[in-house]
């Protein structure tokens, strides 16, 4: 039996969008179905339908189909938006270009290349002709519009209106030279959908021919829409998995557009002695890698063979030898002409945020007046009269509007970590600038940490060294995995938000992590039936030099008795000594045959100058700091550990504290831990949550 | 105690393919990864990948695909590694060793080596 | 792939000296370095986790220090039973590297 095509990838996909007509004449066919792909194969065919299929839509919660005559674009029709529904458009009726000969076209471009308009299909004024579109089914010979019904060179053609002139061509584009993109098409969102040797392209939302990682729910950014070439990763140009089962994938023939400028919003800030960001931008003249071996030509082949080209990277400034980061590396490398070594980064170009010398602020910066416009990630800040509406959202007072003039960094909510602006990037709605604290200023911008004045607990509610196996309501635990491994702890503190340490991300590949939920073994046995398993859509890192990291999942996990969340103290907030608290790990607990579990070790709270005194003076404890020691001698988090949490409780409610960090050795005697402080992040955490979109459950 | 008991020395023709074995004993054999590190006299210690016995999961150096291929029988407590189309580059000492659980961790036994010598 | 690059190549020392070995990244590896001892004819044996824990049964002559890209072994006072090579490898990036090894000799 022949295997029926999927056809799905014919069609242009609007979620949570349907369609109602307003002209009641309009026909609709409607049935229960599956899924999409059942809809699709008989929208394609015609199967058993009393007009040519252009539209339908998938009824997710009925698991229905509506097929329609007609599309968007159709008169006597309307948008409308629902959660249960999507709309799926065959794209040769709203493609305004054609691929090969245009046999598939099925636009409405009815006016030949000399401009005369085309004579209706179903008359024989002035020309009679044989192209009856009863004897060509299927091929759309509708009206007066521009058709190919037999595949003919010259592309679509009519019967004009002229009887001086029988037919002639219409002037339709190859869809390859409506389509273009800059530089390398990280950025492009056009709607090729087929490759350049002509192979349509899988949608990115199917797993068949190819199963790939590219989700469009995981990377949101990516504009990984229905089945249309895109650069995700870096690739020399947009490319596509292909519907071929034997041709995995390959990539499309997308002109480089004619003004090969990037927009204002893709164009990283360019610097010539030192790195932004991730040095994107970098564009100076190092050519050595960090420990002075020289870097290889961008040009040659020798002695590392690459395509990282200055021909394949256009916009890159791949010139001569030197250091570029062109790939969205942590910061820019070469190849290098050791042929023993083949990439190395170049650490030691200084980093911008260090070199700002005159500009800086005091206190927490709210009355900073530079003129920087720039996020620390090099993104350009955007104009605070366009955002007054989101500021608004998370402040309850009046700003100051003659301080937010034009797109600078400025701190009007009293940010306690400085000044900050909106980017107009949306996965990214705005970030802090990198300006750092004058020098000298010792402005406390949180008072009194040893005393307590603020309670931690907002209402009166209800791995580890040598810990204790724990399987109490511990449901806000979460395993961060790399690559299939654990490597760090991170509490749910929100169904779609995880608090973690920024250690735990070697690879910037965030395919290359899931967050795993509900467990209580390392390795997820015996918990088959509470483990949630979710992937990593963003990492937000934290206020410089606070080692904290917000993960956003891919999607929100589901509360129930396995998976909570865990409460976040308030602001600026002290515990009183000596209060008992616990981290949990999966990490290193120096047993020879570790059973997996998660485990708990006691600590209670120290103040921060008794704390400096343990550590012989070596270590002076600032505001962002916690300190706890261990009640057990020996026993606190270690490697594996790190991202978790110091638990603690107050007026009967628990609260995560602390995050564990990399530090001093681990459980050593009567050497305390040191944890990043919560409460000194907490605006911060809930400015992110209050601002960054997340995926609807 | 804790031990990892390698096969024994192994003398190959070019071409052909070996399996070195890495038996454990003294701990709970599908919670730990294998690591595989590969040593040439003047080449200092090479990661070549790693297995946890419990699931199968594999991570590989890049340079070691098609290479070396991991596998493990957790009934035997036994760990395998596959080493194909042998070349001369392929002579060395090669150890198993016991990982940790979670990434990053370091490797607490090992075993006492296998050494493979390629020639014709 | 990051590189671990191990200072010196090898050393000679006398019983009761102290010996530094250093070990520097190519990027930033946190604290994820571990210091391997390597006598003649036999297999590595872990001395250091995490870049500044001794392990279990190690001698508190040997201790190492460092975070992100350098880091030290040392050893307080040398012993004849410590001629060895020490190799120091990074477990935070893919693939796992060490460095080429310190050859330490006793005089």
């Known amino acids: 039996q022949r295997k029926r095509r999927n056809t799905i990838h014919e069609f242009k996909k609007s979620a949570k969008t349907t369609l109602i007509k307003i002209d009641p004449a309009l026909k609709i066919k409607t049935k229960k179905v599956n899924t999409a792909d059942q809809c699709a194969n008989r929208c394609t065919r015609n199967k058993g339908l009393p007009f040519t299929c252009k539209a339908f839509v998938f009824d997710k919660a009925r698991k229905q189909c509506l097929w329609f005559p007609f599309n968007s674009m159709s008169s006597g029709v309307k948008k409308e938006f629902g959660h249960e529904f999507d709309l799926y458009e065959n794209k040769d009726y709203i493609r305004n270009c054609i691929i090969g000969k245009g046999r598939s076209y099925k636009g409405t471009v009815s006016i030949t290349k000399s401009g005369i308009k085309c004579q209706p299909w179903s008359s024989m004024i002035p020309h009679e002709h044989s192209f009856l579109p009863s004897s060509y089914r299927g091929k759309d010979l509708q009206e007066n519009y521009c058709r190919n019904p037999r595949g003919e060179e010259g592309g679509p053609w009519c019967f004009t209106s002229n009887p001086e002139v029988r037919y002639e061509v219409c002037d339709i584009p190859q869809c390859s030279e409506v389509e273009c993109m800059t530089c390398n098409g990280e950025s492009y969102r056009g709607l090729m959908d087929h490759t350049e040797s002509g192979k349509i392209c899988q949608r990115w939302d199917h797993q068949t021919p190819h199963r790939h990682k590219f989700l469009p729910e995981r990377y949101p950014d990516k504009g990984f829409d229905d089945n249309y070439c895109r650069n995700p990763d870096g690739q020399p140009r947009p490319w596509c998995y292909t519907l071929d089962p034997h041709t995995r994938w390959e990539y499309c023939a997308i002109k480089t557009c004619a003004d090969n400028t990037m927009n204002d919003t893709d164009v990283p800030l360019e610097t010539t002695e030192c790195i932004q960001g991730q040095g994107e931008g970098y564009r100076g003249t190092v050519n050595t890698i960090w420990n002075g071996i020289p870097c290889q030509r961008w040009d040659s082949q020798y002695p590392h063979e690459h395509d990282m080209t200055p021909e394949n990277f256009k916009c890159k400034d791949l010139r001569e030898n030197y250091c570029r980061n062109p790939d969205g590396s942590e910061s820019p490398w070469c190849f290098t002409t050791d042929p023993n070594i083949r990439v190395g980064y170049c650490s030691q170009i200084p980093n911008c945020d260090m070199s700002h010398g005159q500009d800086c602020y005091r206190g927490n910066g709210k009355n900073y007046m530079g003129n920087l416009s720039q996020t620390r990630s090099g993104l350009t800040c955007s104009m605070w009269d366009k955002n007054m509406e989101d500021l608004h959202r998370h402040i309850f007072w009046e700003p100051d509007a003659s301080k937010l003039n034009e797109n600078y960094c400025r701190n009007p909510d009293d940010d306690a970590h400085g000044p900050w602006c909106y980017t107009g990037n949306p996965l990214i709605p705005w970030d802090y600038c990198p300006i750092s604290r004058c020098e000298g200023d010792t402005t406390p911008t949180i008072v009194n940490l040893d005393h307590p004045v603020i309670s931690c607990a907002k209402t009166k509610q209800l791995r580890v060294v040598n810990g204790i196996p724990t399987r109490t309501n511990i449901g806000w635990m979460v395993s961060l995995r790399y690559r299939n491994k654990h490597i760090c702890g991170g509490s749910l503190i929100k169904e779609s938000w995880v608090l973690t340490a920024r250690q735990c991300f070697p690879s910037r590949d965030l395919k290359d992590y899931e967050a795993w939920l509900g467990i209580h073994d390392v390795h997820g046995r015996g918990d088959e039936k509470c483990k949630q398993v979710l992937n990593v859509s963003q990492l937000v890192y934290g206020p410089e030099g606070s080692d904290l990291v917000l993960m956003k999942l891919a999607r929100p996990a589901v509360l129930d008795d396995f998976v909570s969340t865990i409460d976040l103290p308030n602001y600026g907030c002290t515990i009183p000594e000596k209060t008992s608290c616990s981290v949990y790990g999966w990490g290193y607990t120096g047993l020879i045959n570790y059973d997996g579990l998660l485990r708990v070790a006691h600590l209670y709270i120290m103040g921060n100058e008794k704390c400096s005194q343990h550590h012989r003076g070596k270590v002076t404890l600032n505001e962002s700091e916690i300190c706890a020691g261990a009640e057990k001698i020996g026993s606190g988090p270690c490697e594996g550990d790190y991202g978790g949490p110091l638990v603690c409780e107050q007026h009967k409610m628990r609260m995560v504290l602390g995050v564990i960090v990399p530090g001093r050795g681990c459980a050593i005697p009567n050497r305390p831990g040191i944890f990043v402080r919560v409460a000194y992040y907490a605006k911060w955490i809930h400015k992110i949550i209050l601002t960054y979109k997340v995926p609807q459950s | 105690q804790v031990q990892l008991q390698q096969s024994g020395a192994d003398l190959m023709k070019p071409g052909a393919s070996v399996k070195i074995s890495c038996k454990a004993t003294g701990y709970t054999f599908s919670g730990n990864w294998i690591e595989w590190v590969k040593q040439r006299p003047g080449h200092g210690l090479e990661w070549i990948g790693e297995i946890l016995p419990g699931s199968g999961n594999t991570n590989y150096n890049e340079k070691f695909k098609g290479k070396a291929t991991f596998t493990a029988d957790t009934s035997s407590n036994t760990a395998y590694m596959q080493l194909s189309s042998l070349t001369s580059e392929d002579s060395a000492v090669y150890y198993c060793a016991r990982g940790g659980h979670y990434y990053g961790s370091s490797w607490d036994y090992w075993g006492q080596g296998t050494t493979l010598t390629v020639s014709s | 792939n990051i590189v671990m690059t191990q200072s010196p190549k090898s050393m000679s020392m006398s019983v009761g000296e102290r010996v530094t070995l250093t070990c520097k990244a190519s990027e930033n590896v946190v604290t994820y370095v571990s210091w391997y001892q390597q006598k003649p004819e036999q297999s590595p044996k872990l001395l250091i986790y995490?870049?500044?824990n001794r392990y279990t049964g190690v001698p508190d002559r040997f201790t190492g220090s460092g975070s992100a890209t350098d880091f030290t072994l040392t050893i307080s006072s040398v012993q004849a039973e410590d001629l060895a090579d020490y190799h120091c490898?990074?477990?935070?990036?893919?693939?796992?590297?060490f460095g080429g090894g310190t050859k330490l000799e006793i005089k």
């Open positions: 490898g990074q477990g935070y990036s893919y693939p796992y590297t």
């Open positions: 995490g870049a500044s």
